[in-house]
Interface confidence: low
């Protein structure tokens, strides 16, 4: 089959894989007049990586609560066994009934856009249901996700979220929309309204067209012991133990306290749906208790005192004292002042000494005063707030908060790369590549102090030498290292990093990046001498910038071969001289050669070698650079991209043309193609330039 260059350049020639992973095709090239020998185009096929999603892809959440996604819910894997950190989910469509957020990031921030399978495994991806204004029994939300991990094809996933009052929820012991209890002054009466007791979420389980025909029937199973319940002024009793949601909503339910003390009271009830004409219907139901707190009419409510945040390190435990939680209440003993956790942060939990290992949600001022209450910092090192409600058992509960700031147990200064200073500039800004502090998360507020300064330069902020700076200044590019002494190609300095009370030290290495253009090109022939000139090494730009002649010093290499100075003309006496130092002028004059040796002690074949050079110029620090090159046995048919001053003796004898190249003279016509072949017209042009040159 014949294919034209224009078809190749136009992308019209396709390769279709079948069979083994390694293979290719043979081809010849022709311009109509000349035909090249056969060539082989190698093709390697890669096995397709497939992503798969396991897990139920359903999440059940308690109303108004936070639930982590788990591997049971969402578990991605790939046929290549990809690291979970490289399995990335993108949130295509976020939740409608709540929000998705990361446990270790600001929970008030923007919606989560990306997360990894590793973060799911760690329990760091959280769904928070936001309570709607309208009651519901069960609601459903969906998240549309896209799983990706190049080179595999993306996979779409839908995560179904069920929010149900039917669930047994520690955060919400009641299955009703509201069951808040009642406060009533001693000897008085108070109306129980839907602000305190509301079962309209049970009604919400009925399809809306039929909802008006339904009601919720409350059956009192245990009556109040210190007072009486009345519906429309008629007392409830064992013979008439029922009231309806509609009566509650109309404000017809009243509790009348009988006097004689301020002990707790309440009643137990069973609530279930009632159909048209009072018929019992299948549907949600619950058995619960309604608490009634009787208040002393003369009592003064407790006064919360100012709270100092608790500070402790990650992984530790610290007691909570009156500095964090205290109230002034002349009427109550510490044991009567009770706190209840309404919302806990993700950075740890409260525990009581002798009360088991798990978190506590209720405790008293006596627990605080005796040092029995402690905070366990088992989460990430972020600040968090406990939202509490505090009551003395007589007054209505008061909201309070307790701030907890978790400090990292240790920090690490991450040094990803040395600081590279461009040779002609002599200065460079530090970035996160050089200095970045992490604990269990990134520490953007880190501060640095110089504890051992550089030998050959200064650290500057705003052009002035400094010994202290911040991560923010680094991130803004304001911290600069500048060489003040042009005698070394490298330097270092030591800093002490401080973040949230924890410190760590690190050494930053500084190297000078040579202003040198290096171009080794394709393989160089073993046994030949090639010309070292500005097409291979060029410090011309450095010469212009410094108004001087740059000098090179050979530090190391080559392993197989040597750098030599060649005589200017055939008449010049003497052979090649070994070179340790040379200048840009020597390169431009074509006075230097590289004798490419053959690796000893092994069969002829391709090899690698390099030169390490130190480059000096006036008024700038020196820099170390390397010229890495590949070598191969000499091939007379191959066009080399550098000028050859001589070719191997054996090759000249075989060709029968000893005059084609002389060891000390200019290259003969067969031995050189000084301009590298560059493809400008697409794939075919590149082949033509290399095959027909």
């Amino acid at each position: 089959r014949t294919r034209s260059g224009s078809q190749l350049d136009g992308g019209l020639v396709l390769f279709s894989h079948r069979g083994t992973l390694d293979g290719g095709f043979r081809f010849r090239l022709s311009d109509g007049e000349h035909t090249s020998p056969g060539h082989f185009f190698r093709v390697t096929a890669q096995k397709q990586v497939l992503l798969s999603l396991k897990g139920s892809q359903t999440l059940t959440v308690c109303p108004g609560s936070v639930q982590p996604l788990s591997s049971q819910t969402l578990r991605a894997s790939s046929s290549a066994g990809t690291d979970p950190q490289l399995l990335l989910y993108r949130v295509v469509r976020g939740p409608q009934l709540g929000r998705l957020f990361h446990a270790q990031q600001d929970s008030t921030g923007e919606a989560l856009v990306n997360f990894t399978q590793a973060e799911v495994y760690a329990g760091n991806i959280l769904y928070e249901h936001e309570m709607p204004p309208e009651p519901f029994w069960e609601a459903h939300d969906t998240l549309e996700l896209q799983l990706s991990s190049p080179p595999a094809r993306d996979v779409a996933a839908t995560l179904a979220v069920a929010v149900s009052f039917e669930a047994a929820c520690p955060q919400r012991p009641s299955h009703l929309w509201k069951n808040k209890g009642l406060w009533v002054p001693e000897g008085q009466r108070a109306r129980i309204t839907v602000a305190a007791l509301d079962a309209s979420n049970l009604l919400a389980s009925v399809p809306s067209p039929q909802r008006s025909e339904h009601d919720v029937l409350f059956q009192v199973t245990q009556f109040p012991s210190r007072g009486q319940l009345l519906v429309s002024e008629e007392p409830l009793h064992a013979g008439q133990p029922h009231f309806l949601q509609s009566q509650l909503a109309a404000g017809q339910l009243v509790y009348a306290h009988g006097g004689g003390g301020t002990q707790q009271d309440g009643f137990h009830f069973r609530a279930h749906l009632q159909g048209p004409a009072g018929a019992s219907v299948a549907g949600p139901q619950t058995s619960e208790a309604f608490a009634i707190t009787v208040r002393d009419v003369n009592e003064r409510p407790p006064q919360p005192q100012a709270s100092v945040p608790l500070r402790l390190t990650r992984g530790s435990r610290a007691p909570i004292s009156r500095a964090q939680l205290s109230v002034v209440d002349p009427d109550s003993a510490p044991g009567e002042i009770e706190y209840e956790v309404q919302r806990a942060p993700h950075n740890g939990f409260l525990s009581l000494v002798g009360g088991g290992l798990g978190p506590v949600t209720r405790f008293t001022q006596a627990d605080v005063d005796s040092g029995r209450l402690a905070f366990v910092a088992n989460g990430s090192s972020v600040a968090g707030i406990f939202q509490l409600s505090m009551s003395d058992g007589a007054s209505p509960p008061l909201p309070m908060s307790l701030a907890v700031d978790i400090l990292p147990s240790a920090i690490e200064v991450q040094l990803r790369a040395p600081l590279e200073v461009p040779q002609a500039l002599g200065r460079s800004s530090l970035s996160q590549q050089q200095l970045r502090v992490v604990s269990d998360r990134e520490e953007p507020e880190a501060a640095y102090r110089l504890i051992q300064g550089p030998q050959y330069g200064h650290l500057l902020v705003g052009g002035r030498p400094t010994s202290a700076f911040s991560q923010f200044q680094i991130d803004q590019g304001e911290v600069v290292f500048a060489f003040t002494n042009s005698s070394s190609s490298h330097d270092h300095f030591r800093v002490l990093a401080l973040a949230r009370g924890v410190n760590a030290s690190a050494v930053v290495n500084v190297t000078v990046r040579a202003l040198l253009h290096v171009w080794a090109g394709g393989p160089w022939p073993q046994g030949a001498t090639l010309r070292l000139d500005p097409t291979v090494l060029d410090a011309g730009e450095l010469a212009n910038r410094t108004d001087s002649v740059p000098r090179f010093r050979l530090l190391e290499g080559p392993r197989h071969g040597r750098v030599v100075r060649v005589p200017r003309a055939r008449t010049e006496p003497g052979g090649s001289q070994l070179v340790e130092q040379f200048t840009q002028q020597d390169l431009e004059d074509g006075r230097l050669g590289l004798e490419v040796g053959r690796p000893e002690g092994r069969a002829p074949g391709p090899a690698g070698d390099s030169l390490t050079l130190e480059l000096w110029a006036q008024g700038v620090p020196p820099a170390v650079a390397s010229l890495d090159f590949a070598t191969e046995p000499y091939n007379a048919a191959r066009p080399y991209s550098v000028a050859l001053l001589s070719v191997p003796e054996a090759a000249r004898t075989e060709a029968g043309k000893p005059e084609s190249s002389t060891p000390t003279g200019e290259p003969g016509p067969m031995a050189s193609s000084p301009e590298p072949a560059v493809a400008k017209g697409g794939f075919l042009s590149f082949l033509e330039a290399n095959m027909f040159s």
């Epitope: 069960e138 069920a162 149900s164 039917e166 047994a168 012991p173 009641s174 299955h175 389980s205 058995s287």
Partner: antibody, heavy 117, light 113 residues
Framework: QVQLVQSGAEVKRPGASMKVSCKAS????????IHWVRQAPGQGLEWMGW????????NYAQKFQGRVTMTRDTSTSTVYMELSSLRSEDTAVYYC??????????WGQGTLVTVSS | DIVMTQSPDSLAVSLGDRATINCKSS????????????LAWYQQKPGQPPKLLIY???TRESGVPDRFSGSGSGTDFTLTIDSLQPEDSATYYC?????????FGQGTRLEIK
């Protein structure tokens, strides 16, 4: 992993009471309902009721109302089901099952109760 | 109470073939608010507790092979088992989880020929 381990088989006389236990492990006990389902020999499955281990709230099938009592002990993560006034037709395997909403995702191994004079 | 009726009571199907079990409820178990059917399917082998296969009529429980699938809406539902394996020999039950008392079908005994 989630485990529900039930008490051993029992033989009871008609009119007596039985109390079967179900010990939960491998998950947060108070976050999930425990239901009781029974299966008479060679017969199908029959739902008896549920208990909310968090609040202690219960919901019994009408058929068992007045005879069944479900309780829980959060300190040991154990749920109990007591059935009184036993008759021969109460001979069955009694299962406890865990649910979040209303389908039964994990089951105990079952407890055979034989009522015989 | 909602009555659940399964058909057939028993069936024998060849290895590798498809088995279909039907379940009918005496009233709709479709919640029109969320468009979900509150129906579950279980598999029970002799001497073992039931095992959840499907809930919400068509959502497969985690770890259940994808040859098990559920379909249907309102009052009529189907459990389909494709390319039957020897280990699929068991009794299958449907259950409505729409309202209490939760009720089960009488069961369908599946035998592999």
């Amino acid at each position: 992993q989630v485990q529900l381990v039930q008490s051993g088989a029992e033989v009871k006389r008609p009119g007596a009471s039985m109390k079967v236990s179900c010990k939960a492990s491998g998950y947060t006990f108070t976050n999930y309902y425990i239901h009781w389902v029974r299966q008479a020999p060679g017969q199908g499955l029959e739902w008896m009721g549920w208990i909310n281990p968090n609040s202690g709230a219960t919901n019994y099938a009408q058929k068992f109302q007045g005879r069944v009592t479900m309780t829980r002990d959060t300190s040991t993560s154990t749920v109990y089901m007591e059935l009184s006034s036993l008759r021969s037709e109460d001979t069955a395997v009694y299962y406890c099952a865990k649910s979040w909403v209303s389908w039964f995702a994990s089951w105990g191994q079952g407890t055979l109760v034989t009522v015989s004079s | 109470d909602i009555v659940m009726t399964q058909s057939p009571d028993s069936l024998a199907v060849s290895l590798g073939d498809r088995a279909t079990i039907n379940c009918k409820s005496s009233q709709s178990v479709l919640n029109s608010k969320n468009n979900r059917n509150y129906l579950a399917w279980y598999q029970q082998k002799p001497g073992q507790p039931p095992k959840l296969l499907i809930y919400w009529a068509s959502t497969r429980e985690s770890g259940v092979p994808d040859r098990f699938s559920g379909s249907g809406s309102g009052t009529d539902f189907t459990l389909t088992i494709d390319s039957l394996q020897p280990e699929d020999s068991a009794t299958y039950y449907c259950q409505q989880h729409y309202s209490t008392p939760f009720t089960f079908g009488q069961g369908t005994r599946l035998e592999i020929k």
